[in-house]
Interface confidence: medium
């Protein structure tokens, strides 16, 4: 009823002292190699001369940090990044960073990278609204503090401020065009 040699599992390493013979009921815990993380139970148990349990180690590393336009990576570059490792970016002049300067490898995926935007605080086209339009011809770029007005299509009523303003590269909240209640 004893068990002999320990079973081997990909990227899993048995902990403790290796023995020639394991008694029935004895448990052995495995740990994962660098870059790998245990998925589920980490032990095997000796039952009736056989080992039960199957520790599974999955790769949680990341490769190729996200590319950020107008930025470069200032931390050391690696071919493979373990989960929890961070990578730091810096924007090229005259761009300004929106988002945190670091991304983190989180169980095989990178967190959202920052953006490097034109620091002048310009805005893109105003946001579209349902059943309404802006009253002026839309431009691709708007200067800081510039504003536009919305109007609703026939039979729709405007709720909120009809004028929105560009501030810090972001438009203020646009109005809504609501269908009037029919009584």
């Amino acid at each position: 009823t004893d068990c002999l040699s320990l079973p081997s599992f990909e990227n899993a390493i048995p902990m403790g002292e290796k023995k020639d013979v394991y008694k029935a009921g004895e448990q052995v815990t495995y740990t994962c190699a660098t870059y790998y993380k245990m998925d589920g139970a980490s032990n095997v148990t000796c039952i009736n001369s056989r080992w039960t349990g199957r520790p599974t180690c999955r790769d949680t590393s990341c490769v190729n940090p996200p590319t950020v336009q107008n930025a470069y990576i200032v931390s050391r570059q690696m071919s493979k990044y373990p989960s929890g490792e961070r990578v730091r970016y810096q924007c090229r002049s005259p761009y300004e960073m929106f988002g945190d300067e670091e991304v983190m490898c989180l169980n095989g995926n990178w967190t959202e990278p920052p953006q490097c935007k034109d620091s002048t605080g310009k805005c893109g086209p105003p946001p579209p609204i349902d059943n309404g339009d802006i009253t002026s011809f839309p431009l691709s770029v708007y200067a800081p503090a510039s504003s536009v007005e919305y109007q609703c299509q026939n039979l729709y009523q405007l709720e909120g401020n009809k004028r929105i303003t560009c501030r810090n590269g972001q438009w203020s909240e646009p109005p809504k065009c609501l269908h009037p209640c029919v009584i």
């Epitope: 945190d100 300067e101 967190t111």
Partner: antibody, heavy 117, light 106 residues
Framework: QVQLKQSGPGLVQPSQSLSITCTVS????????VHWVRQSPGKGLEWLGV???????EYNAAFMSRLTITKDNSKSQVFFKMNSLLVDDTGIYYC???????????WGQGTSVTVSS | QIVLSQSPAILSASPGEKVTMTCRAS?????MHWYQQKAGSSPTAWIF???NLASGVPPRFSGSGSGTSYSLTISRVEAEDAATYYC?????????FGAGTKLELK
């Protein structure tokens, strides 16, 4: 350990402004952004805005016209100011550290704000 | 902005039971995060980016989902899990939160 401690008034008159200071410890504001979130019985949790490690800000468009977030890296302090308060702005205001993907991993203890005359 | 609908609003479970709560988004989202909040306390980070448990969260918790439908599952509920759980999306600005699922223990 990482902490965010908030200080600010509990009672604000309508049309007045609200100022809250968030003092952080065990991490640097030059590395991490700080978000502001509020919680009220009527509207639940609402994201108000964030100041990033580089000092740039993003605001919820619904609050943008009356909200300003600034910071002093050397003092490890983030400052929140909201103007023209309404009774509707009553709630608990939290500062919280950015983790990534606009999630937060550590929250301040909250500042309970009542807007009333 | 994206609206997140959490169901059920109140979930009653016995210790040892398996429970699942869901969060549905009005449009597809890139990331879903979960927070736990106990009465009188600040929220606590619980699950990041759909399925990554925050530091100190017991492995009986798991998260899954994609697109517009996400869920948080507790394999065997314990008394200390009684709290309100909120989902939060990121992908479309502004980030928004669900109204919460309150987990009560029988």
């Amino acid at each position: 350990q990482v902490q965010l401690k908030q200080s600010g008034p509990g009672l604000v008159q309508p049309s007045q402004s609200l100022s809250i200071t968030c003092t952080v410890s065990d991490f640097s504001l030059t590395n991490s952004g700080v978000h502001w979130v509020r919680q009220s019985p009527g509207k639940g949790l609402e994201w108000l805005g964030v100041i990033w490690s580089g000092g740039t800000t993003e605001y919820n468009a619904a609050f943008m016209s009356r909200l300003t977030i600034t910071k002093d890296n050397s003092k490890s302090q983030v400052f929140f100011k909201m103007n023209s308060l309404l009774v509707d702005d009553t709630g608990i205001y939290y500062c919280a550290r950015n983790f990534g993907n606009y999630a937060v991993d550590y929250w301040g203890q909250g500042t309970s704000v009542t807007v009333s005359s | 902005q994206i609206v997140l609908s959490q169901s059920p609003a109140i979930l009653s479970a016995s210790p040892g039971e398996k429970v699942t709560m869901t969060c549905r988004a009005s449009s597809s989202v890139r990331y879903m995060h979960w927070y736990q909040q106990k009465a009188g306390s600040s929220p606590t980070a619980w699950i990041f980016a759909t399925s990554n448990l925050a530091s100190g969260v017991p492995p009986r918790f798991s998260g899954s989902g994609s697109g517009t439908s996400y869920s948080l599952t507790i394999s065997r509920v314990e008394a200390e899990d009684a709290a309100t759980y909120y989902c939060q999306q990121w992908g479309t600005k502004p980030p928004t939160f669900g109204a919460g699922t309150k987990l009560e223990l029988k």
